[in-house]
């Protein structure tokens, strides 16, 4: 079982390989000096049907380096960064993992593209392994809450409350969504 020639790349090179390309072979992509690699640099020859070989993912691309590009902080609800830090410049990558009791959908890594957006795939999502969710928490008078998403919230996530200036927060500042689908505390109040 073998794979066909690896997908070509413009403005870059492919690591050396011999033919036939055996299942298990890794080929690596790199870009010319003034270009930045967007996407996974390593492709693996695999077989899904034990008959034909295929590459496990699409080839990355080489984008002409844009020194003015910068990408915003990428947020994955239920997840956290395991690699990457600000500032995010063209070609920088960020890799995510999911919190306990969450599983990942999509690709764990994304790259800062010349268009100031993360790609070449969407940000991954972290899905709760528990079917239960906590109901949306109310806003409070003279205060705000920072929820990672709107509406019902998956267990493991939290909401942080804060008060407007001149008001004092009474109660719990951070409320966690429990695996039971219940909140760990009642919303606080903001008092003068």
């Amino acid at each position: 079982i073998s794979c066909g020639s690896p997908p070509p790349i413009l403005n870059g090179r492919i690591s050396y390989y011999s033919t036939p390309i055996a299942v298990g072979t890794v080929i690596r992509y790199s870009c010319s000096g003034t270009f930045r690699l967007i996407g996974e640099k390593s492709l693996l020859c695999i077989t899904k049907d034990k008959v034909d070989g295929t590459w496990d993912k699409p080839a990355p691309k080489c984008e002409y380096f844009n020194k003015y590009s910068s990408c915003p902080e990428p947020i994955v609800p239920g997840g956290y960064k395991i690699r990457g830090s600000t500032p995010y410049r063209h070609g920088d990558s960020v890799t995510f993992a999911c919190k306990t009791n969450f599983s990942m959908n999509g690709n764990k890594s994304v790259w800062c593209q010349a268009n100031n957006m993360w790609g070449p795939t969407r940000l991954p999502t972290c899905v709760s392994v528990f079917p239960l969710e906590c109901p949306a928490l109310p806003m409070i008078h003279n205060g705000h809450h920072t929820s990672e998403n709107v509406g019902s919230i998956a267990p493991g996530l939290s909401v942080t409350y804060s008060c407007e200036s001149g008001y004092l927060l009474v109660g719990e500042k951070i409320i966690n969504c429990l695996s039971s689908g219940k909140w760990s505390a009642v919303p606080p109040t903001c008092e003068e």
Partner: antibody
Framework: QVQLVQSGAEVKKPGSSVKVSCKAS????????ISWVRQAPGQGLEWMGR????????NYAQKFQGRVTITADKSTSTAYMELSSLRSEDTAVYYC????????????WGQGTLVTVSS | EIVMTQSPATLSVSPGERATLSCRAG??????LAWYQQKPGQAPRLLIY???SRATGIPARFSGSGSGTEFTLTISSLQSEDFAVYYC????????FGQGTKLEIK
């Protein structure tokens, strides 16, 4: 960090086989590749082959083709290296080493297993 | 197999001084090169990957450079714990190691 714990030292007769194990703990066994690298006394490092456990795909250095078999048991997060038709020049410390995904370099190494081939 | 050649075989340097170790690939390997440190009776330890990226927890005195066929590992100010054997490894086409450079106290 992933910990790799290898089986104990072995003394073997020429012509026999040896099977060394490498148990991984921490991380996800399915998200990395395990290579076997050997080091003869006072010598350098020599790559023997590697397996990607999630796919069950093993590849071998030409020098060892037909004499080495690398397998993995996902249920116990353990990789194995079996070397057959042993000769005295196979006396070495055998290491398992882990590469994250298919990065190409080894972040973590086992403690090594000394295999002595002697009549 | 891509042949990796390290030089010198042995390097004698005084503590506090700079050490420069070389590694040459038999063919172009882009930046697909790693450096390892090995002390007697221990497994190798990853220092540098992708020719110039320091591995987690590796002190800043270790740096790597080069691409194509010529690579260098530099230790800016040698500490007593740095005296060991150093290996380069390519991962352009499968995997192969250099024969090692022994860094000893002068």
């Amino acid at each position: 960090q992933v910990q790799l714990v290898q089986s104990g030292a072995e003394v073997k007769k020429p012509g026999s086989s040896v099977k060394v194990s490498c148990k991984a703990s921490g991380g996800t066994f399915s998200s990395y590749a395990i290579s076997w690298v050997r080091q003869a006394p006072g010598q350098g490092l020599e790559w023997m082959g590697r397996i990607i456990p999630i796919l069950g795909i093993a590849n071998y250095a030409q020098k060892f083709q037909g004499r080495v078999t690398i397998t993995a048991d996902k249920s116990t997060s353990t990789a194995y290296m079996e070397l057959s038709s042993l000769r005295s020049e196979d006396t070495a410390v055998y290491y398992c080493a882990r590469e994250e995904d298919i990065s190409g370099y080894y972040q973590d190494w086992g403690q090594g297993t000394l295999v002595t081939v002697s009549s | 197999e891509i042949v990796m050649t390290q030089s010198p075989a042995t390097l004698s340097v005084s503590p506090g001084e700079r050490a420069t170790l070389s590694c040459r690939a038999g063919q172009k390997i882009s930046s697909y090169l790693a450096w390892y440190q090995q002390k007697p009776g221990q497994a190798p330890r990853l220092l540098i990957y992708d020719a110039s990226s320091r591995a987690t927890g590796i002190p800043a005195r270790f740096s790597g450079s080069g691409s194509g066929t010529e690579f260098t590992l530099t230790i800016s100010s040698l500490q007593s714990e740095d005296f060991a054997v150093y290996y380069c490894q390519q991962y352009e086409y499968w995997y192969s190691f250099g024969q090692g450079t022994k860094l000893e106290i002068k």
